[in-house]
C-alpha cells in the first residue's frame, strides 16, 4: 500500500535541475512548515490523549483561530486572487500569536516549534511581496495579542494541552487550504 508524506512519514524534496518560480518556492516552503507541524502534532498526541478527545468543541469556543471559508475567495467557486491573498496573509498574521504561545509548549521538539514560527514569518514576507492589495491587510493589535497570550498561558493544564492540539490542527488545515489556493495563482 502506498505511503505518502504525511503524519507518519518524512518527505525528502526531489532535487531540482532548474530554479524554482516564486510560486513553487512558496509551495515548498508551506510543505516544510507542514512537516514541522506534523512533528509537533506527534509529540502532542504521544504526550496526551487530546488527539482522540471529544471535548474539542469546549476549548474551540474560546479560540478565534483563522479558518478558510467560501466567502474568502480561495475556493474554486468564486475564486478571487486578491481577496484570497488578503485572507491568507491576514490569517497567517492572526496565527502568529498562537505560534508564540506554542513556543514553551514542547520539550523534545522545542527547535521544531521555533522553526515553524520563523518559517511562518518568512512565508508572510514572501506573500506580502506577491500581494498588490496590501492596504486591505489588517495586522492584529500588539496589545490585543499580548492579553490573549497572557489569557492562554493562564489556563489550566488540560486546557493548555487542548489549546496546543487545536492550534496545530487548525494551522495545519489553514496551510493546506493556502497550498491549494496558491496553486491557482
Amino acid at each position: 500500500a502506498p505511503v505518502l508524506p504525511g503524519e507518519d512519514s518524512k518527505n525528502v524534496a526531489a532535487p531540482h535541475s532548474q530554479p524554482l518560480t516564486s510560486s513553487e518556492r512558496i509551495d515548498k516552503h508551506i510543505r516544510y512548515i507542514l512537516d514541522g507541524i506534523s512533528a509537533l502534532r506527534k509529540e502532542t498526541c504521544n504526550r496526551s490523549n487530546m488527539c482522540e478527545s471529544s471535548k474539542e468543541a469546549l476549548a474551540e469556543n474560546n479560540l478565534n483561530l483563522p479558518k478558510m471559508a467560501e466567502k474568502d475567495g480561495c475556493f474554486q467557486s468564486g475564486f478571487n486572487e486578491d481577496t484570497c491573498l488578503v485572507k491568507i496573509i491576514t490569517g497567517l498574521l492572526e496565527f502568529e500569536v498562537y505560534l508564540e504561545y506554542l513556543q514553551n509548549r514542547f520539550e523534545s521538539s522545542e527547535e521544531q516549534a521555533r522553526a515553524v514560527q520563523m518559517s511562518t514569518k518568512v512565508l508572510i514576507q514572501f506573500l506580502q511581496k506577491k500581494a498588490k492589495n496590501l492596504d486591505a491587510i489588517t495586522t492584529p493589535e500588539p496589545t490585543t495579542n499580548a492579553s490573549l497570550l497572557t489569557k492562554l498561558q493562564a489556563q489550566n493544564q488540560w486546557l493548555q494541552d487542548m489549546t496546543t492540539h487545536l492550534i496545530l490542527r487548525s494551522f495545519k488545515e489553514f496551510l493546506q487550504s493556502n497550498l491549494r489556493a496558491l496553486r491557482q495563482m
Epitope: 518527505n11 526531489a14 478558510m68 467557486s77 488545515e173 491549494r180 496553486r183 491557482q184
Partner: antibody
Framework: QVTLKESGPVLVKPTETLTLTCTVS??????????VGWIRQPPGKALEWLAH???????RYNSALKSRLTISKDTSKSQVVLTMTNMDPVDTATYYC??????????????WGQGTLVTVSS | DIQMTQSPSSLSASVGDRVTITCRAS??????LHWYQQKPGKAPKLLIY???QSISGVPSRFSGSGSGTDFTLTISSLQPEDFATYYC?????????FGQGTKVEIK
C-alpha cells in the same frame, strides 16, 4: 486499510444521467488535506481526470466536461457521488474513484477503487 | 491545458532488460510529475511521485528523474510482473492530465 469501491449502473441509455457512488473506508472524507476524485478510461485508451472534491467541500472539475458534471460528498456515509448528464456512447468507459491529497494536498491519486465499466447504448 | 506526451507508445523487451520511458510536458511543471502502472483489467497503481520519490512497497528497480518539462521512468531490470502500461500525470495544475500511456510488452 484504505479501500474505495465504485457502484452504479453498468448500462445507461444515451441522453440519460449517470450517477456513480464511491464508498470509502480506512480514512475520513473530513480529514484536512484529503479528497476523492473520479477518473475514467475508455476501452483501450488513456486515463482522463473528471472531477474531485476536497475535505472542506471545495470542488474541481475538468473544464471540458464541467457543464455535465456534479460531485458531492456525504461524510457521515463515507460516500462521494458523481453525476454526469446527457450521456453519449463516447462516455463508455471504466470509471474509477481514487483518494487524493494528503499532508501536502498532493495532486496525485494514491489509492484507487477497482473501477466500474459503464456502457452507454440504446 | 498542459499536454503530457509519452514515448514510446509501446515497446517490447525481455526479462532483465533496462527499460526507459520518457514523458514530456508542454510547459514546465517543476517536479510535479507522477507515474502510475496499470495491468490489464486492473486499476492504476501509484509508482513514483514528485518525479523521483519512491513509494513504500514499490521495488527499487523502479526509479524516476527529471524536472521542468522532461521526465524519465526507468526499470533497471525488467521482471515478468512489470509487463504493463505506464502513465505519467501532470500534478502541477488543473486540469490534471495524463500521458497517453506506454505499453511494455514481452519480446
Amino acid at each position: 486499510q484504505v479501500t474505495l469501491k465504485e457502484s452504479g449502473p453498468v448500462l445507461v441509455k444515451p441522453t440519460e444521467t449517470l450517477t456513480l457512488t464511491c464508498t470509502v473506508s480506512g480514512f475520513s472524507l473530513s480529514t484536512s488535506g484529503m479528497g476523492v476524485g473520479w477518473i475514467r478510461q475508455p476501452p483501450g485508451k488513456a486515463l482522463e481526470w473528471l472531477a474531485h472534491i476536497w475535505w472542506d467541500d471545495d470542488k474541481r472539475y475538468n473544464s471540458a466536461l464541467k457543464s455535465r458534471l456534479t460531485i458531492s460528498k456525504d461524510t457521515s456515509k463515507s460516500q462521494v457521488v458523481l453525476t454526469m448528464t446527457n450521456m453519449d456512447p463516447v462516455d463508455t468507459a471504466t470509471y474509477y474513484c481514487a483518494r487524493i491529497g494528503g499532508l501536502y494536498v498532493d495532486y496525485l491519486m494514491d489509492y484507487w477503487g477497482q473501477g466500474t465499466l459503464v456502457t452507454v447504448s440504446s | 491545458d498542459i499536454q503530457m506526451t509519452q514515448s514510446p507508445s509501446s515497446l517490447s523487451a525481455s526479462v532483465g532488460d533496462r527499460v526507459t520511458i520518457t514523458c514530456r510536458a508542454s510547459q514546465s511543471i517543476s517536479d510535479y510529475l507522477h507515474w502510475y502502472q496499470q495491468k490489464p483489467g486492473k486499476a492504476p497503481k501509484l509508482l513514483i511521485y514528485y518525479a523521483s520519490q519512491s513509494i513504500s512497497g514499490v521495488p527499487s528497480r523502479f526509479s524516476g528523474s527529471g524536472s521542468g518539462t522532461d521526465f524519465t521512468l526507468t526499470i533497471s531490470s525488467l521482471q515478468p510482473e512489470d509487463f504493463a502500461t505506464y502513465y505519467c500525470q501532470n500534478g502541477h495544475s488543473f486540469p490534471w492530465t495524463f500521458g497517453q500511456g506506454t505499453k511494455v510488452e514481452i519480446k
